[in-house]
């Protein structure tokens, strides 16, 4: 199971597998999540301890039972690895730490105007892992505005010091935000030179590449296949780095495969897990458990559910089987990779999927023809549920927004389909920020079914809600994940932190925007809204939002998009952009379909279509 709670003033005793310095408990938790053996962690903030050496200490821990005794320690923070937590698993860490200097090897210094610019430089430098920036008020004038790019052997700071007017942070390469771009090619019969940073056993070059991608210092790799001439080196995956960031030389070599880390890819990174099953292969390692199961897929599921299991072998030897079930050997090792790989066996092997992002758990618990007027540019991954509904007739254009609410479901406004009810003219783009990034090669979803509310009537404002079932389910990523739906009981809830997003017009007679816009808008009571729209009926199934003075609003092209509010610590889809008198006019709020009022309808339609709810509502 996924355990997310943090324990304040608590420290786990014993079980240490690694320690490092991290700026906060969340980063410590992320390092625990990606460490092959870490199940629990304890973190000591600067305020919690006088011992300078232990300040910002992050202690990664393992336990055979899955738990350790907790001792009281004022200020300490402890918690669990997020292995098995599906979409909450991410190596991306965007926070900037003020008043903190993260130490490491300083390999590049430059003058920049802001900490954001420094972080961007780090993200665009192949070797940079973290950075420090001296602000304009730093005590030594010659260091002001200095941006120091850094790395360390373990990818984490070698020390962290409290220092005024310094701001630090990490590269956003794990957020798939690097501008460097990556080499997807795999080079057969080629070996790279340079420094080996680690050596693991893998069944193929693709697993080797994923391990390289998530290793803090691996920039490229060479894999020796199972027919490599030296038996002891078969299936060896050498993780490598170099001063320049690229291999200084490569040698043609039979039965070797080389390639690059994919950490510098833009927009998408490989999942930090290996889902392929390898028939006729045995993985050796420390025995965790042996169980009888029916089929190799069940064996993999069993391994995934047992949090300490890293890989498995399903044996089809007659002596290992009874009736339809055979032995499933659950195993682990120090580095998460098999200690031995044997071919030509009667087994099938594979890895735990505990670090895969595609679990069924509710991911919406995780983070944030009507354009936004008075808004600002959004950033990557800020509103990962936002989709663009586009129509391809002679040309292709953005018409409406929508919200991803499940792997195969988008919620939008019914009026988006007025006059365009044919599902095959629509293309749905998810996980995008800039419309200009869409090319003929950009993947899109097609519509399997459009479900318009049965009481919706064209050119009326009521029941302006529609569901789209996609032809194929979407995988969730940092940039593409669903928004939580409200409960039916939220019909009278008061929300105070609400945002509208979209690519719509920036003024009434404007044009579609390139970058997704966001605007913070207060909700308006229905009574107040009704006063502003005396010619229309504002029903309890609508919600209004806007400033009395105008200036900020949704506009044409934002229709169908989300009005989301952060409530009790979670983002919820409160409204669907529907209609309004002009855009951002004084005392003319925007009108949105109230999602809580349609929860019965949404769940009825999504369940009857699938047999079970596919939404990422909080359940």
């Amino acid at each position: 199971g996924c355990l997310t709670q943090l324990y304040e003033n608590a420290f786990f005793r014993g079980g240490d597998v690694a320690s490092m310095y991290t700026p906060n408990a969340q980063y410590c938790q992320m390092r625990c999540t990606f460490h092959p053996r870490c199940l629990l962690f304890s973190f000591l903030p600067a305020s919690s301890i006088n011992d300078m050496e232990k300040r910002f200490g992050c202690f990664l821990k393992d336990s055979v039972t899955g738990t350790l005794p907790k001792v009281h320690r004022t200020g300490a923070v402890s918690g669990h690895s997020l292995k098995q937590c599906g979409h909450q698993i991410s190596a991306c860490h965007r926070d900037i730490y003020k008043g903190v200097d993260m130490r490491g090897v300083n390999f590049n210094v430059s003058k920049v105007s802001s900490v954001e610019e420094c972080q961007k430089r780090c993200t665009s430098n192949i070797r940079c892992q973290f950075f420090s920036y001296a602000t304009q008020t730093f005590h030594k004038a010659e260091y002001r505005n200095n941006c120091l790019l850094k790395y360390s052997p373990g990818g984490t700071p070698t020390a962290i010091k409290v220092l005024s007017n310094v701001e630090s942070g990490f590269s956003l390469k794990p957020c798939a935000l690097s501008e460097i771009g990556c080499h997807m090619n795999i080079f057969q019969h080629l070996a790279f030179s340079d420094v080996d940073v680690a050596r693991v056993l893998t069944p193929d070059a693709f697993v080797c590449r994923t391990i390289c991608t998530y290793h803090p210092n691996c920039l490229f790799f060479t894999f020796y296949t199972n027919v490599w001439k030296i038996e002891s080196q078969r299936n060896v995956c050498l993780l490598k780095t170099s001063e320049s960031g690229t291999p200084s030389s490569s040698t043609p070599q039979e039965n070797t495969i080389s390639g690059y880390s994919l950490l510098t890819c833009k927009r998408t990174l490989p999942e930090p897990c290996h889902s392929k099953i390898y028939p006729g292969v045995d993985f050796g390692g420390e025995e965790l458990n042996v169980t009888f199961v029916k089929g190799v897929n069940v064996c993999q599921e069993t391994c995934t559910k047992m949090i300490r299991c890293q890989f498995f072998t399903y044996s089809l030897l007659p002596e290992d089987c009874k009736e339809e079930k055979c032995k499933c050997f659950l195993r682990l090792s120090m580095d998460g990779s098999p200690t031995r790989i044997a071919y030509g066996t009667q087994g099938s092997s594979g890895y735990s999927l505990r670090l895969c992002n595609t679990g069924d758990n509710s991911v919406c618990t995780t983070k944030t023809s009507t354009r936004i007027v008075g808004g600002t540019n959004s950033s990557w991954g800020e509103w990962p549920w936002q989709v663009s509904l586009q129509v391809k007739l002679t040309a292709q254009r953005h018409l409406c927004g929508g919200s991803l609410i499940g792997h195969q479901w988008v919620l939008t406004a019914a009026h988006c389909f007025d006059g365009l009810p044919l599902q095959d003219v629509w293309r749905i783009y998810s996980g995008i920020l800039n419309l200009s990034d869409i090319t003929k090669d950009t993947p899109f979803s097609q519509i399997k079914e459009i479900i318009i509310h049965q009481n919706y009537k064209v050119s009326e404002g009521n029941h302006d809600i529609a569901l789209i079932k996609l032809q194929a389910p979407l995988n969730y990523t940092e940039f593409q994940k669903p928004i939580c739906l409200p409960s039916k009981g939220d019909t009278s809830t008061i929300y105070t932190n609400c945002w509208v997003t979209g690519w719509g017009f920036s003024k009434e007679k404007g044009e579609i925007q390139n970058i997704l816009q966001k605007v913070n808008i207060p909700l308006v009571t229905n009574e107040e809204c009704q006063k502003r729209y005396q010619d229309y009926k504002i029903t309890q199934r609508m919600v209004c939002a806007g400033y009395k003075e105008g200036g900020k609003d949704a506009c044409k092209g934002d229709s169908g998009g989300p009005l989301v509010c952060k409530h009790n610590g979670m983002w919820r889809l409160v409204g669907i952009t529907s209609w309004g008198e002009g855009c951002a006019r004084r005392e003319q709020p925007g009108v949105y379909t109230k999602v809580a009022e349609y929860m019965d309808w949404i769940l009825e339609k999504t369940q009857s279509s699938d047999g079970k709810a596919q939404m990422q509502s909080p359940a």
Partner: antibody
């Protein structure tokens, strides 16, 4: 860490009113609702109502409507639940509870209110 | 109001037993359900919910399942520290309502 500390036990006569307080710390008081739940001795839990301190918005269980008032003081990060026209069946432990999402993730220690003549 | 019914108000099991506590809603609550554990003299403690899964500090022997109107809380292997009263609560429709509770004891 999140802490909810409630006021002490109360002994009240039938027909009187009681006001129970709940002081919150360890989080931004205005960002989360505060709910009130009661538990008569040896019995189950019953939801009374809630307030959103950031907006002042309230929601009540109709069963208590007219008798209960939930308020919040932003300056002291304290929520209050006042129950009037007390009767013997109002004898219970009254809890404040803060949600994460919908479920009540954090609870006060409880305040025993005894109604007796 | 949605009624939540926990069929047995008490249950006695042996150490190591698999225990199942049931909760039935008077209408479909679409998995919007939380379970709480309450030990004598203490406030209830959130055990698990559709919103957050199993809460930290609880052993993985606890699991929840169900859909529609019917939900169950299972304990794979009953331990002495599991002795408590367990309540279900729906958060689909206000007023939020709780089940009557199931008191779990060791034989």
């Amino acid at each position: 860490q999140v802490q909810l500390v409630q006021s002490g036990s109360e002994l009240k006569k039938p027909g009187a009113s009681v006001k129970v307080s709940c002081k919150a710390s360890g989080y931004t008081f205005t960002d989360y609702e505060m709910h009130w739940v009661r538990q008569p001795p040896g019995k189950g839990l019953e939801w009374i109502g809630a307030i959103h301190p950031g907006s002042g918005g309230t929601a009540y269980n109709q069963k208590f409507k007219g008798r209960v008032t939930i308020t919040a003081d932003e300056s002291t990060s304290t929520a209050y639940m006042e129950l009037s026209s007390l009767r013997s069946e109002d004898t219970a432990v009254y809890y404040c509870a803060r949600p994460y999402g919908y479920p009540f993730a954090y609870w006060g220690q409880g305040t025993l209110v005894t109604v007796s003549s | 109001d949605i009624q939540m019914t926990q069929s047995s108000s008490s249950f006695s099991g042996s150490l190591g037993d698999r225990v199942t506590i049931t909760c039935k809603a008077s209408e479909d609550i679409y998995n919007r359900l939380a379970w709480y554990q309450q030990k004598p003299g203490n406030a209830p403690r959130l055990l698990m919910s559709g919103e957050t899964g199993l809460e930290a500090g609880f052993h993985l022997r606890f699991s929840g399942s169900g859909s529609g109107k019917d939900y169950t809380l299972s304990i794979a292997s009953l331990q002495t520290e599991d002795v408590a009263t367990y309540y279900c609560q729906q958060y689909w429709s206000t007023p939020w309502t709780f089940g009557g509770g199931t008191k779990l004891e060791i034989k």
